[in-house]
């Protein structure tokens, strides 16, 4: 479902990643150096920046982030 419009709800931050707001709606997500072997599954559609460096992700499927623009 759609997230209600609110200034007090935190946008989705994947487990163990470090997140910080980017303006009114967006979210910068740092998932670097977490030993991930695949993309985080619960990325917010409001993600403006995603750092997956220093992980063990060997390949990406076509269109791996369909919810992101």
């Amino acid at each position: 479902g759609s997230s209600p419009r609110s200034g007090v709800l935190l946008r989705g931050c994947p487990t163990h990643c470090h997140c910080e707001p980017d303006g009114r709606m967006l979210l910068r997500v740092d998932c670097s150096d977490l030993g991930l072997s695949e993309l985080p599954s619960n990325l917010s559609v409001f993600t403006s920046y995603l750092d997956l460096s220093m992980n063990n992700i060997s390949q990406l499927l076509p269109n791996p982030l369909p919810s992101l623009r």
């Epitope: 200034g7 007090v8 935190l10 946008r11 931050c13 910080e20």
Partner: antibody, heavy 117, light 107 residues
């Protein structure tokens, strides 16, 4: 620097109304939501509701609909909380606080509202 | 509404000691947790957002952790100015709800 300055303490009789103001400075008022939270004597924090000053869109806690009304006057960068038909249990400290993407980063100093006959 | 439960209600420690404050949500809040500090006569202060993100100006002795329903605020070595009341708050769903608070007092 960011400042939220609230109006002074109020002593009201049951059934009366009160309007608490929160004057914002040090940032662009319409870029941040304004939250309202109350704290009854010796109690924890309770969310009343929020307003987006850019268009006055509001969300209220279900327990605060009806008697509690949030508003803003962007020309003076001020948010307001009006409570009507005051009851003794409305006695509390009322806080305004600004928020952006989910957390409240600056709070007002609080306004004590006492309801007593 | 999501119920937030903090423990202990009061924690008595000495400066230099490590403080561990707990916050439990009645359902999974997906790391959407903030911590605040309240001192008498002062404005409430944001310490940590998104479970572990330190707000600007907050000393590095404060840290946040946890997942799912269980979260922790840790103060690695208590300073005299840290004795206060601490509240957790979930930002997962409306209405946002706060824990009842933990009072950190000097032993």
């Amino acid at each position: 620097q960011v400042q939220l300055v609230q109006s002074g303490s109020e002593l009201k009789k049951p059934g009366a109304s009160v309007k608490v103001s929160c004057k914002a400075s040090g940032y662009t008022f319409t870029n941040y939501w304004m939250q309202w939270v109350r704290q009854a004597p010796g109690q924890g924090l309770e969310w009343i509701g929020e307003i987006d000053p850019s268009d006055s869109y509001t969300n209220y806690n279900q327990g605060f609909t009806g008697r509690f009304v949030l508003s803003v006057d962007t020309s003076v960068s001020t948010a307001y909380l009006q409570i009507s038909s005051l009851k003794a249990e409305d006695t509390a400290v009322y806080y305004c606080a600004r928020s952006l993407s989910g957390y409240v980063d600056y709070w007002g100093q609080g306004t004590t509202v006492t309801v007593s006959s | 509404d999501i119920v937030m439960t903090q423990s202990p209600a009061t924690l008595s420690l000495s400066p230099g000691e490590r403080a561990t404050l707990s916050c439990r949500a009645s359902q999974d809040i997906s790391n959407r947790l903030n911590w605040y500090q309240q001192k008498p006569g002062q404005a409430v202060r944001l310490l940590i957002s998104y479970r572990s993100r330190l707000h600007s100006g907050v000393p590095a002795r404060f840290s946040g952790s946890g997942s799912g329903t269980d979260y922790t605020l840790t103060i690695s070595s208590l300073e005299p100015e840290d004795f206060a009341v601490y509240f957790c708050q979930q930002g997962n769903s409306l209405p946002p709800t706060f824990g009842g608070g933990t009072k950190l007092e000097i032993k």
